[in-house]
Interface confidence: low
């Protein structure tokens, strides 16, 4: 049995994945729950099993097709339901009319690499993963650099207000180990949010040449 209020949040990665988290204040005791996706304009539907991620929240990924296939468009509506088993029946715990392109969260950028490194600067590039062609160039990025002795939370955010898949980090300290992360967000969508941060890229600036200020 389920009591208490629930929150049901889903995001579309713009291609073939809808990730959902369902939070429930009340206790779920040995109950099997799933998310069911029923698109309004497609001849398919999809289900995923909700798995616990904390004491009161569950998550699952609706895999709609091949990772780079464009499974939904800007005018699709997907009815998403949380269904939990009660005996031999399924009970609807939550429901929403999901507009994929109003609820976007892209995959984290991938393939980070150092293009060129010097004593005080470093040029880094990356690629976006599984992003819809619908966006064209309407994407923005945030980047951060981890300096020695600091935490990621303390790192200042660098904002790139256009689809620019590279950055030149300036005013770095010579012969110093850094880490770099980037994330991406489409400009489209009322409830769109930032992608997860990329895997950190570690790099080291070149040492200063003896007797020279480079």
């Amino acid at each position: 049995a389920v009591n208490g209020t629930s929150q049901f949040t889903c995001f579309y990665n713009s291609r073939a994945n809808i990730s959902c988290v369902w939070s429930q204040d009340g206790a779920l005791q040995d109950t099997s729950c799933q998310v069911h996706a029923w698109p309004d304009r497609r001849r398919w539907n999809q289900t995923c099993e909700l798995l616990p991620v904390s004491q009161a929240s569950w998550a699952c990924n609706l895999i709609l097709g091949a990772p780079d296939s464009q499974k939904l468009t800007t005018v699709d509506i997907v009815t998403l339901r949380v269904l939990c088993r009660e005996g031999v029946r399924w009970r609807v715990m939550a429901i929403q009319d999901f507009k994929p392109f109003e609820n976007l969260r892209l995959m984290a950028p991938i393939s980070l690499q150092v293009v060129h490194v010097e004593t005080h600067r470093c040029n880094i590039s990356w690629e976006i993963s599984q992003a819809s062609h619908y966006f064209e160039r309407h994407l923005e990025f945030e980047a951060r650099t981890l300096s020695p002795g600091h935490t990621w939370e303390e790192a200042p955010l660098l904002t790139l207000k256009q689809k620019q898949e590279w950055i030149c980090l300036e005013t770095l300290t010579p012969d110093t180990q850094y880490e770099f992360q980037v994330r991406v967000k489409p400009l489209q969508g009322e409830f769109t949010t930032w992608s997860p941060w990329s895997q950190p890229l570690a790099f080291r600036t070149k040492p200063a040449a003896l007797g020279k200020d480079t």
Epitope: D40, R41, R42, R43, T73, T74, V75, I77, T79
Partner: antibody
């Protein structure tokens, strides 16, 4: 058999309001979106908005400030309300439903109801 | 908004003629639909998803195209085909229709 039946048309004063009903039979409005489309005399078709199965709406931006689409699931009926009417809102108003999926286009239409805005 | 431009706006053809109507979208669309409307009647869906025939529609009607350019064809015009034909896009809101093509018999 899927049927849509509009009602509530007639003569409306300029500046007045319009409330139309679309009674659905042969399907549930909790399972399908219902759209409103109008056609001015001798003119083409103009999409106004939709109410989806779960109750959310999408409107044509040109009408969003004066248009409300709602529904009563228990009566299986969709309602269309437009305010601040003017002469150019004179038209036949249709409700329509897609096939099993929107992908199938507007497969089902009501017969239409004529609204005349005039003093 | 995506503008849909149909041509011609009207045409007159003989029974048995092949009739072609084009619809040009102001930007690329993924889904195109065609409707027939007889005087005093509600529109009737003929073609969905660019080229698929709706239920009960005779095979003389067909559709094709992609991107911004779409075509609707009546392979052999019949007297009952006298009507106005509309294209419609369902790729972005607001949904928009062409201005219509009135087909008459010579």
């Amino acid at each position: 058999e899927v049927q849509l039946l509009e009602s509530g048309g007639g003569l409306v004063q300029p500046g007045g309001s319009l409330r139309l009903s679309c009674a659905a039979s042969g399907f549930s409005v909790t399972s399908y979106g219902v759209h409103w489309i109008r056609q001015a005399p001798g003119k083409g078709l103009e999409w106004l908005g939709v109410i989806w199965s779960g109750g959310s709406t999408d409107y044509n931006a040109a009408f969003i400030s004066r248009l409300t689409i709602s529904k009563d699931n228990s009566k299986n009926t969709v309602y269309f309300q437009m305010n601040s009417l003017r002469a150019e809102d004179t038209a036949v108003y249709y409700c329509a439903r897609a096939g099993d999926y929107n992908y199938d286009g507007f497969a089902y239409w009501g017969q239409g109801t004529l609204v005349t805005v005039s003093s | 908004d995506i503008q849909m431009t149909q041509s011609p706006s009207s045409l007159s053809a003989s029974v048995g003629d092949r009739v072609t109507i084009t619809c040009q979208a102001s930007s690329s669309v993924s889904f195109m639909y065609w409707y027939q409307q007889r005087p005093g009647k509600a529109p009737r869906l003929l073609i969905y998803d660019t080229s698929n025939l709706a239920s009960g529609v005779p095979s003389r009607f067909s559709g094709s195209g992609s991107g911004t350019s779409y075509t609707f064809t009546i392979s052999s015009l019949q007297p009952e085909d006298i009507a106005t034909y509309y294209c419609q896009q369902w790729s972005t809101y607001p949904l928009t229709f062409g201005q219509g093509t009135k087909v008459e018999i010579k």
